[in-house]
Amino acid sequence: GPGPCDGNPCANGGSCSETPRSFECTCPRGFYGLRCEVSGVTCADGPCFNGGLCVGGADPDSAYICHCPPGFQGSNCEKRVDRCSLQPCRNGGLCLDLGHALRCRCRAGFAGPRCEHDLDDCAGRACANGGTCVEGGGAHRCSCALGFGGRDCRERADPCAARPCAHGGRCYAHFSGLVCACAPGYMGARCEFPVHPDGASALPAAPPGLRPGDPQR
């Protein structure tokens, strides 16, 4: 059958040991009684842990009460409250108890303080500037048209920012892709090849379809 120490009858952190007849509690400092239920501790002893506020207990005969801060419980605020046991995060979100606050780390495709918003729905999602919404892997994303970027394709991206056209060539941000207009004397998709005075180019081997001054296709 169940032993007398099952369920730990000793309060206030006392340790239970079985005796031939029953059990015996070995009480921590400041506690006494059969089950260590009587406190000899006062607020002067600072019995409240984890920032708990002690009230009462000015003399050995009067009890004290610990008012615990959020996230802690127990007569001495010694126990951390497991707020994640209530499973507050929805849609498979990971619960993180930071003590001062609760955080939900949401799975891809979900958002909100409790992961309550389902983002994996292209029907209700607008991608700006000609972008298209793509679903997959439990998430969604906007596939942006050329020249745009960001979460909703609202940010302008300049394909010419990296200065891809060599030898002073001009880069234009055309909707079909970047375009190089080469300075006189150069040719190639990126204006990388000089054109010799006789009209021949310095191409190691002329790529098919590449003419002097050809733009990027």
Epitope: R156, R170, Y172, A173, F175, V179, A183
Partner: antibody, heavy 118, light 109 residues
């Protein structure tokens, strides 16, 4: 919506000066374009005047426009055209236009009329 | 750089075909950086074709561009009343130079 709007046109006397402004909305000159000025005299075809390349600020002019016309970038959304020693023959609608690649003007403003007359 | 357009004016019946040619005194950049515009009174030019043969977004497929180097053609197949306008070719040349043709007036009857 990307738009261009010209302003600053009006009546000016021969040998006078005028500055036209092109204001962009829906985009800025942080991307690389040729922002250009094109004019069209009454009953005539369009005539290219000048461009400023927003990538590095370099400018290009029609041979006839060098010296009297100056194109510059005033801000990330405005380009200006300064015109001096204006003649009656400069009477035209002045358009601001953007080359977005392949050397064509895909975006135009509605134009501003400049009349040179005494 | 001079662009010469022929003929002007040109007349066509509704449903007919209109052909406009544009000749350049020198080759355009990349041999195909030539565009075509349509202009109606009181409006700026509107691009129809870029890079000699590419149809601009939103332009009806009855407009077709062809050619390379110095010789280019705009063809309107199945002309509509709304196509009555003046058409211009425009080239881009090495050295970052632009030029427009003189224009071709199209009358649709």
């Amino acid at each position: 919506q990307e738009q261009l709007v010209e302003s600053g046109g009006g009546l000016v006397q021969p040998e006078g000066s005028l500055t036209l402004t092109c204001t962009a909305s829906g985009f800025s000159f942080s991307s690389s374009y040729d922002m250009c000025w094109v004019r069209q005299a009454p009953g005539k075809g369009p005539e290219w005047i000048a461009c400023i390349y927003t990538g590095d600020g370099s400018t290009d002019y029609a041979s006839w426009a060098k010296g009297r016309f100056t194109v510059s970038k005033a801000s990330s959304t405005t380009v200006t055209l300064q015109m001096t020693s204006l003649a009656v023959a400069d009477t035209a609608t002045y358009f601001c236009a953007r080359n977005s690649g392949y050397g064509y003007f895909g975006l135009w403003g509605p134009g501003t009329l400049v009349t040179v007359s005494s | 750089q001079v662009l010469t357009q022929t003929p002007s004016p040109v007349s066509a019946a509704v449903g007919g075909t209109v052909t406009i040619s544009c000749q350049s005194t020198e080759s355009v950049y990349g041999s195909d950086w030539l565009s075509w515009y349509q202009q109606k009174p009181g409006q700026p030019p509107k691009v129809l074709i870029y890079q000699a043969s590419n149809l601009e977004i939103g332009v009806p497929s009855r407009f077709k561009g062809s050619g390379s180097g110095t010789q280019f053609t705009l063809t309107i197949s199945g002309a509509q009343c709304d196509d009555a306008a003046t058409y211009y070719c425009q080239g881009y040349y090495s050295g970052y130079i632009y030029a427009f043709g003189g224009g071709t007036e199209v009358v649709v009857k």
